[in-house]
């Protein structure tokens, strides 16, 4: 008995070959002897029932001259899994068709961190093995249900599932979209008074995007977090619902989500968490954002540089006179110089690879007042 594997919704070709390699009479039947189609000597395809009943069944007329009389079944259904009989030249050829189906749990659009379940439906009596490969090359294998927990952004794309049965295989392609922000976390470094731009680009595109969001902020100086802004998203259009008076954030009306803080001030330095709840989805998308603020000041005979916000303990804060060696350099959040000499002083926040933030302050001779450029 020949075995043919098929995929639900697609087409299968069941073979039937003549030893003569020429056109001959043939008939395809179900195992209960009901006729499906055939050719009775006039080169005309005759169907065994009403057109509506047999419109999915066909043959390849062009192949008949070569002694090949395949049965083509279009728009395969799971119930097409059965034995088919080809009668020709006083012999019967049995062909077993097994139709498989691989589906993703409920939805192919899943939030980052959620689980993906891929389910194989197979005909009774079959014992297939299945292996699925993610777009980033991760292989999962198992029985009729395969699960991937904690979906990552890199899991977005085409998953390829290979079903193996009796050394024959059939391949399924399933497009999965992982709903997430492009970045899990970002840090913005600003001098006091500068405008701050926060951007929250999404890592996916969909036709219509509807939901609601909120930015909660934990300022370093505050004992508790507070909601800075809430907004709605309707078909990719952003509308602000509520915003605090201090700070008065502004929000862009289009995607990507974009927030502007008019001024970076020490009291705003800290960490925020933007959440986005999408319509018809359980769970929320999250992006962490951090703000580090630097202030350089001169009070009487003391030049001070301070930073506020979530900095790595490896960062170095330095005060130096332009084009000279650093006068003071510490892995702390504040440094100062007593009786600084006149000139342009630089406050630098650096790590092993770069200067992250720089603020200049002009120290005038002692009889003048300082100027901040």
């Amino acid at each position: 008995k020949t075995l043919v594997l098929g995929k639900e919704g697609e087409s299968a070709e069941l073979p039937c070959e003549s030893s003569q390699k020429k056109i001959t009479v043939f008939t395809w039947k179900f195992s209960d002897q009901r006729k499906i189609l055939g050719q009775h000597g006039k080169g005309v395809l005759i169907r065994g029932g009403s057109p509506s009943q047999f419109d999915r069944f066909d043959s390849k007329k062009g192949a008949w001259e070569k002694g090949s009389f395949p049965l083509i079944i279009n728009k395969l259904k799971m119930e097409d899994s059965q034995t088919y009989i080809c009668e020709l030249e006083n012999r019967k050829e049995e062909v077993e068709l097994w139709v498989f189906k691989v589906t993703a749990n409920s939805d192919t659009h899943l939030l980052q961190g959620q689980s993906l379940t891929l389910t194989l439906e197979s005909p009774p009596g079959s014992s297939p093995s299945v292996q699925c490969r993610s777009p980033r090359g991760k292989n999962i294998q198992g029985g009729k249900t395969l699960s991937v927990s904690q979906l990552e952004l890199q899991d977005s794309g085409t998953w390829t599932c290979t079903v193996l049965q009796n050394q024959k295989k059939v391949e399924f392609k399933i497009d999965i979209v992982v709903l997430a922000f492009q970045k899990a976390s970002s840090i913005v470094y600003k001098k006091e008074g500068e405008q701050v731009e926060f951007s929250f680009p999404l890592a996916f595109t969909v036709e219509k995007l509807t939901g609601s969001g909120e930015l909660w902020w934990q300022a370093e100086r505050a004992s508790s977090s507070k909601s800075w802004i809430t907004f709605d998203l309707k078909n990719k259009e952003v509308s602000v619902k509520r915003v605090t008076q201090d700070p008065k954030l502004q929000m862009g009306k289009k995607l990507p989500l974009h927030l502007t803080l008019p001024q970076a001030l020490p009291q705003y330095a800290g960490s925020g968490n933007l959440t986005l709840a999408l319509e018809a989805k359980t769970g929320k998308l999250h992006q962490e954002v951090n703000l580090v603020v630097m202030r350089a000041t001169q009070l009487q005979k003391n030049l001070t540089c301070e930073v506020w916000g979530p900095t790595s303990p490896k960062l170095m804060l330095s005060l130096k006179l332009e084009n000279k060696e650093a006068k003071v350099s510490k892995r702390e959040k504040a440094v100062w110089v007593l009786n600084p000499e006149a000139g342009m002083w630089q406050c630098l926040l650096s790590d092993s690879g770069q200067v992250l933030l720089e603020s200049n302050i002009k120290v005038l001779p002692t009889w003048s007042t300082p100027v901040q450029p």
Partner: antibody
């Protein structure tokens, strides 16, 4: 391509000095911190020192502080490790590695040299 | 200095197995932890940085996670080339410190 090559290893008596070099190529050297790590025979890895991108800041493991000095020459794309008052326990393979620093948050050593062997023995 | 306690020190497994290695930090290091693989006679190779970020070119069977001060490296579906030594490294603060290492060999 991006690479680091160590040199200067050898056999030396306790109390003597040795100077290791790390030559970089294939990247903008002056934008990266460079570390020295070491691995004693059959043992785990140990961090030794780092020098920042501009040479202004240097940090050392307690076990080498006061004996080893790290320096760099950005015009020659090299980092040196001057090792004085060497001890038997300094015997190891010494690796230099490039540190990537992003946003003052993400740090990692993505490029390593193949190592140079230092043997301190009387 | 921050101490990193890595376990197990050695591990025997078979191709296809799922393997986990853990590192515990003696204090809060936020996400400042990387995982490195080392084969005999070779330099270490970066696998995961900042707790859970997969380095370019590293197979996706490697993943990292964190719970408080406990960090985990997971290899899902061991391949023959994965038998090696694995080290965690805290890069949160100086001095950087490594875990003692885990030697992964064939069962």
């Amino acid at each position: 391509q991006v690479q680091l090559v160590e040199s200067g290893g050898g056999v030396v008596q306790p109390g003597r000095s040795l100077r290791l070099s790390c030559a970089a190529s294939g990247f903008t050297f002056s934008s990266y911190g460079i570390h020295w790590f070491r691995q004693a025979p059959g043992k785990g890895l140990e961090w030794v020192a780092i020098i920042w991108f501009d040479g202004t800041n240097k940090f050392y493991a307690d076990s080498v502080k006061g004996r080893f000095t790290i320096s760099r020459d950005n015009s020659k794309n090299t980092v040196n490790l001057q090792m004085n008052s060497l001890r038997v326990e300094d015997t190891a393979i010494y690796y230099c590695a490039r540190e990537v620093a992003i946003q003052g948050y993400y740090y990692y050593m993505d490029v390593w040299g193949n190592g140079t062997t230092v043997t301190v023995s009387s | 200095a921050i101490q990193m306690t890595q376990s197990p020190s050695s591990l025997s497994a078979s191709v296809g197995d799922r393997v986990t290695i853990t590192c515990r930090a003696s204090q809060d290091i936020r996400n400042g932890l990387g995982w490195y693989q080392q084969k005999p006679g070779k330099a270490p190779m970066l696998l995961i940085y900042t707790t859970s970020n997969l380095q370019n070119g590293v197979p996706s069977r490697f993943s990292g996670s964190r719970s408080g001060t406990d960090f985990t490296l997971t290899i899902s579906g061991l391949q023959p080339e994965d038998f090696a030594a694995y080290f965690c490294l805290q890069d949160y603060n100086y001095p950087y410190t490594f875990g003692q290492g885990t030697k992964l060999d064939v069962k």
